[in-house]
Amino acid sequence: DYKDDDESRTETQPPVTNLSVSVENLCTVIWTWNPPEGASSNCSLWYFSHFGDKQDKKIAPETRRSIEVPLNERICLQVGSQCSTNESEKPSILVEKCISPPEGDPESAVTELQCIWHNLSYMKCSWLPGRNTSPDTNYTLYYWHRSLEKIHQCENIFREGQYFGCSFDLTKVKDSSFEQHSVQIMVKDNAGKIKPSFNIVPLTSRVKPDPPHIKNLSFHNDDLYVQWENPQNFISRCLFYEVEVNNSQTETHNVFYVQEAKCENPEFERNVENTSCFMVPGVLPDTLNTVRIRVKTNKLCYEDDKLWSNWSQEMSIGKKRNST
């Protein structure tokens, strides 16, 4: 018995059958296949698969494999069967099935398609027209993510200079795994003349918080107390603030990084929901001090992509001295 089993391990199995490919949503590509015909009876079938560039090798018992990928270029999967999980075992002859992007002139497809998730409440995508497109092209953006039952069409198409864009509501769901997923995007034209463009936006990247709102500035001795409202929707471990203080007399420009800080000093309006406070030391009260604040997401929560919020409105305190 043992010998037979051993033989079935080294024996090359027949290839899988009926390998087919389909697309779900906008960018979920799914391959399915049937077990090989005439496989060894004492073989516990496993399937070896990898994409055309030998990437993402996988050995698994399932007769399906899926990938979330922007369908801007051809993608192929090769599948073989074997009798163990051992990667060094030679699988059967590999069967390949490819899927090509929708047809069309590549020069007609939109370029620089990118999206930013604003304050975890709406997503704004923008793109440039392709080189081979007429100026009166009417674009449509479609999007899908896990919490939607079907593909949605974005209604708010706009134009900003050379760029076209569209924004749609996308609110962070309490479900802790929500941000581990992605939004699938496709842009095409109403007339079907341009080649569709796809993008996948991970919800852990391209997050831009709203700017903070400065509520109050006050002096106590030589310290400047700053109180501001935090942007909504974020948890405190995911944000930090940059407080910039400019002094008109000394022309100094001080920058402080600040963690969300409780308003515990008597100088602050206390127990106000969603506010943070910071004390800037050694500020001259008899000069004009101008403060502005911006906020950034923490790399441990959202991937680092250098996206700060816009600056808050400036607020000033103190007196501008005469130049005499």
Partner: antibody
Amino acid sequence: EVQLVQSGAEVKKPGESLKISCKGSGYSFTSYWIGWVRQMPGKGLEWMGVIYPGDSYTRYSPSFQGQVTISADKSISTAYLQWSSLKASDTAMYYCARFPNWGSFDYWGQGTLVTVSS
Amino acid sequence: EIVLTQSPGTLSLSPGERATLSCRASQSISSSYLAWYQQKPGQAPRLLIYGASSRATGIPDRFSGSGSGTDFTLTISRLEPEDFAVYYCQQYETFGQGTKVEIK
């Protein structure tokens, strides 16, 4: 004054378990991440992982994932680093440090020397 | 995974001289996350610079940081005897291998 005070030096045998501690004071312990950094004898600094005591959310460096466990007890403002089965290669100085959201370690503990030898 | 490479490995200088330490990232990083530390023998590291250019509390102004993208620099304008130590750059989960500043 912000302070992080670590537990004392440990001498252990391979295969033994160990839990070292880091007590924070002088700031809101639940509002800042606490990180652990390893320094093997004569070598550089290695980022092991961090914990946010406010909700015990942890992140590990891939090199240390599954090798150690980071935990915290916010009621006593203390973070922990533990091993279930020590190896000789775990011999090192371990530092805890406060880790603000902008990702630098701004206050450090004095270090805990862990020696693993048969 | 980002790799930080520090150069030179050792810098031999005299007190009063200017020290320039380099930290190069394998890919572009946000300067918000770049920090510099000083470590003396038998001591814990000490934060000098965060956000690539902001001095930490209590750090003398002879220490300054600059740079963006992939190239960052720590400058000590005039070396004091207490500045001879090992210096590390760091970006979140990654530390550079260190530069030792020793007395010539």
